[in-house]
């Protein structure tokens, strides 16, 4: 299994589960319903998965296909600097923040966006998948 | 279409409480960050109060704080302020606004407003 | 507190002319700005946003500038309904501050 770190790449990736969709060596689950940005990380999470980490701008231009006008969040928050949940700074793509509330990062077709953390969207996970070794 | 109607204003005693309400429709109320803004008899626009999705954080301007309430029903769709201790620097038109979405704090929909009226 | 000082405080004009109204900022404020625009009786109405983006629905005769300290609205070809009251408003940062409005009336 992928074990060890959540936002480990992954290589050689065989399947995912139900309802999610394989791209690229990661699996991707898209969400039907909307949370806030917590409870969407708490669902990431409970999954084994993590709420998305983009790594560079090739990524973000392939998912970028599947997303429509809705924002999605993504594990992107703004604590001193926008930075990833694995602990890495944004440094491939601008987002920008309109008011001080505006601390948590979603996406959609179009780009970035800076949003409250408040506002239920839809959210997007990511995962190795089954069988699996991570890549460190 | 986005519709505001703030009431509960009037006449009030210098010292008095009144609480203001705000119907909210033709939007989700609980996706929005909700505020009170106010108009002087100058016609100077001040900034009241401001209340998160949840209901769960609050924002005021030191002038305000202590003496003013904002709360919200999401189940109700109605904003509400709460005013106490009021003097006649109070005494303004009160508009309920509404964010433009996602926490953008400028005021993109505005009520018709309710006049505060505080006398000795 | 950042203060929002607009400049002039009311202005006469002529349909069809064009007018500017400025407002500063006591410090760095970047693009986060909005302006109002308020009808004699009625409810202020969300012009723009971000120092530059127009509202939904407003009309491309308006164009908002300036980042930092600077700002100005710009109405291009005043039209009959375009005479009232306008606010800036710095929308960041807490207090949400105004300028104290600029008049702009029918010469």
């Known amino acids: 299994l992928c074990q060890g770190s959540n936002y480990s790449t992954c290589a050689s990736c065989p399947s995912c589960p139900d309802r999610w969709m394989k791209y690229g060596n990661h699996c991707y689950y898209f969400s039907v319903e909307e949370k806030d940005w917590n409870s969407s990380l708490e669902f990431c999470l409970a999954r084994d998965s993590h709420l998305l980490v983009i790594t560079d701008n090739q990524e973000m231009s392939l998912l970028q296909v599947f997303l429509s006008e809705a924002f999605c969040w993504i594990g992107l928050r703004n604590n001193s600097g926008w930075r990833w949940e694995d602990g890495s700074p944004l440094n491939f793509s601008r987002i920008s923040s309109n008011s001080f509330v505006q601390t948590c990062g979603a996406i959609n077709k179009n780009g970035l966006q800076a949003s409250s953390c408040e506002v239920p969207l839809h959210w997007v996970c990511k995962k190795c998948p089954f069988a699996d070794q991570a890549l460190f | 279409d986005v519709k505001l109607v703030e009431s509960g204003g009037g006449l009030v005693k210098l010292g008095g409480s009144l609480k203001l309400s705000c119907a909210a429709s033709g939007f989700t109320f609980s996706r929005y960050y909700m505020s009170w803004v106010r108009q002087t008899p100058e016609k100077r626009l001040e900034w009241v109060a401001t209340i998160s999705i949840s209901g769960g954080n609050t924002y005021y301007p030191d002038t305000m704080k202590g003496r003013f309430t904002i709360s919200r029903d999401s189940a109700k769709n109605t904003l509400y302020l709460q005013m106490s201790s009021l003097n006649s620097e109070d005494t303004a038109v009160y508009y309920c606004?509404?964010?433009?979405?996602?926490?953008?704090?400028?005021?993109?929909?505005w009520g018709q407003g309710t006049l505060v009226t505080v006398s000795a | 507190d950042i203060q929002m000082t607009q400049s002039p405080a009311s202005l006469s004009a002529s349909v069809g002319e064009t007018v500017t109204i400025t407002c500063r900022a006591s410090?760095?404020?970047?693009?986060?700005l909005a302006w109002y625009q308020q009808k004699q009786g009625k409810s202020p109405q969300f012009l723009v946003h971000?120092?530059?983006t127009l509202a939904e629905g407003v009309p491309s005769r308006f164009s908002g500038s300036g980042s930092g300290t600077l700002f100005s609205l710009k109405i291009n070809s005043l039209q009959p309904e375009d005479f009232g009251s306008y606010y800036c408003?710095?929308?960041?940062?807490?207090?949400?501050?105004f300028g104290s409005g600029t008049k702009l009336e029918i010469k």
């Open positions: 408003q710095y929308h960041y940062g807490i207090p949400f501050t």
């Open positions: 606004a509404r964010e433009g979405g996602y926490g953008n704090l400028w005021f993109a929909y």
């Open positions: 971000n120092a530059k």
């Open positions: 410090e760095n404020i970047y693009s986060c």
